[in-house]
């Protein structure tokens, strides 16, 4: 997250970190069910661990943390690397979470976002770009949903209805390491960090997010079919 600020503790209990060995964060994710996460499809890896209820990026033990293995990864069938359409994936955890103030799911919004909606994006991704500098703790950033026209103008021929753009002033954006993390609007999960320009936070080049309102049926059916 570029030019965000430290999230208040306990305010993002659905935020997950996807980790490679040894404790290497590569993506964010979102708890949407006691045993299921949503993340970006481009975050798919064979072997990874899931950390929930953790505030700092470092692997130091925190009392609220819960660690899991991903036992099943189900990318949306319409996703094709390295494209960006349909960029979402469900991850089944090896066990159900223990609900606490630090770990609990968020509902996915069935309403599509309208331009001007205020949202919050979070993650442990780099806070500089193109340099790489990681934060000590989870970062939060207020962003506004942009109209689909502004989105298409920013990225001609690259935007479809499985995506929406959101941003703020130039110099504020999600970035590398934030993929799969939540965009929360009006208390529900509206999007996932997906892609954007490089370097991040360039003027008139907003972040692009997976438009989850288009996938509520697939999410529900996939969880039911695999539970």
């Amino acid at each position: 997250i570029i030019n965000g600020s430290d999230c208040d503790m306990h305010t993002q209990p659905w935020q997950a970190a996807l980790l490679l060995r040894p404790n290497q964060l590569y993506c964010g994710a979102v708890l949407v069910h006691p045993q299921w996460l949503l993340t970006a499809a481009h975050c798919r890896k064979k072997v990874f661990r899931v950390r929930l209820g953790h505030y700092s990026l470092s692997p130091v033990y925190e009392s609220g943390q819960q660690m899991f293995q991903g036992v099943k990864s189900i990318p949306h069938p319409g996703y094709s690397h390295p494209g960006h359409s349909n960029d979402l994936m469900l991850i089944k955890l090896n066990r159900r979470i223990r609900p606490t103030k630090d770990v609990r799911p968020i509902n996915v919004s069935s309403h599509c976002p309208s331009a001007g909606t205020k949202c919050l994006v979070s993650g442990w991704g780099t806070t500089k770009s193109p340099q790489v500098h990681f934060p000590k703790v989870l970062q939060c950033l207020n962003i506004s949903v942009l109209s689909q026209k502004r989105c298409e103008d920013a990225y001609p021929r690259q935007i479809d209805d499985t995506m929406f753009c959101a941003g703020d002033k130039a110099g504020r954006d999600s970035c590398q390491g934030d993929s799969g993390g939540p965009v929360v609007c009006n208390g529900s999960l509206q999007g996932l960090v997906s892609w954007g320009d490089y370097p991040c936070a360039r003027p008139n080049r907003p972040g692009v997010y997976t438009n989850l309102c288009k996938f509520t049926k697939w999410i529900q059916e996939t969880i039911q079919a695999n539970s």
Epitope: P130, D197, Y198, C200, R202
Partner: antibody, heavy 126, light 107 residues
Framework: EVQLVESGGGLVQPGGSLRLSCAAS????????MNWVRQAPGKGLEWVSY????????DYADSVKGRFTISRDNAKNSLYLQMNSLRAEDTAVYYC???????????????????WGQGTTVTVSS | DIQMTQSPSSVSASVGDRVTITCRAS??????LAWYQQKPGKAPKLLIY???SLQSGVPSRFSGSGSGTDFTLTISSLQPEDFATYYC?????????FGGGTKVEIK
């Protein structure tokens, strides 16, 4: 078949210019960042330049900064390297290489260069 | 710039031998290291990415390990087609830099 084919190399005098081209086929060129890498005779690999998929980010090795210009034409599936003020030490085989890392995607995961051309030889000599 | 130091610069080995090549970065690069194989007159070929992930189509006798500053490429049982020069490369930070190479020769 995924393929990169370089062209444009040759013999040039010190201070001269050359333009290298790299034609891509078998994949969606505008989804990938690209690189130029060179190898002087009997020496190791040296990264020369990088360009992101949308051309929004470009970088160069210090040894070529201000003299070389990387560009791409996604409509033509082509990558270019304009080389000016050439020096004897620029003599090398020049490879174009596809970068497997999508810098547009916002995961923190880096791969490397998975597809390389056969190389084109540049000789700078009087 | 990040310096990549490979050792040894050359190694003589026989078919069936286990060969280990090391690469050291001048500063931490997490797991973001790639290994390439290059045969004379040919372009390099990506073997391993993210320090330990095998590129599609690469034989399982090749393996990589390490993170931070110290990395290793191992060929568990050297085959005739493995005699080549091997390069490491750090990929997260511009300018990208390669190690000086390790030539694996027939003993």
């Amino acid at each position: 078949e995924v393929q990169l084919v370089e062209s444009g190399g040759g013999l040039v005098q010190p201070g001269g210019s050359l333009r290298l081209s790299c034609a891509a086929s078998g994949f969606t060129f505008n989804d990938y960042s690209m690189n130029w890498v060179r190898q002087a005779p009997g020496k190791g690999l040296e990264w020369v330049s990088y360009i992101s998929s949308s051309s929004s980010y470009i970088d160069y090795a210090d040894s070529v900064k201000g003299r070389f210009t990387i560009s791409r034409d996604n409509a033509k599936n082509s990558l270019y390297l304009q080389m000016n003020s050439l020096r004897a030490e620029d003599t090398a085989v020049y490879y174009c290489a596809r970068d497997l890392t999508s810098m547009q995607s916002r995961d923190y995961y880096y791969y490397g260069m998975d597809v390389w051309g056969q190389g084109t030889t540049v000789t700078v000599s009087s | 710039d990040i310096q990549m130091t490979q050792s040894p610069s050359s190694v003589s080995a026989s078919v069936g031998d286990r060969v280990t090549i090391t690469c050291r970065a001048s500063q931490g690069i997490s797991s973001w290291l790639a290994w390439y194989q290059q045969k004379p007159g040919k372009a390099p070929k990506l073997l391993i990415y993210a320090a330990s992930s095998l590129q599609s189509g690469v034989p399982s006798r090749f393996s990589g390990s390490g993170s931070g500053t110290d990395f290793t490429l191992t060929i568990s049982s050297l085959q005739p087609e493995d005699f080549a020069t091997y390069y490491c490369q750090q990929v997260p930070i511009f300018p990208y830099t390669f190690g000086g190479g390790t030539k694996v020769e027939i003993k």
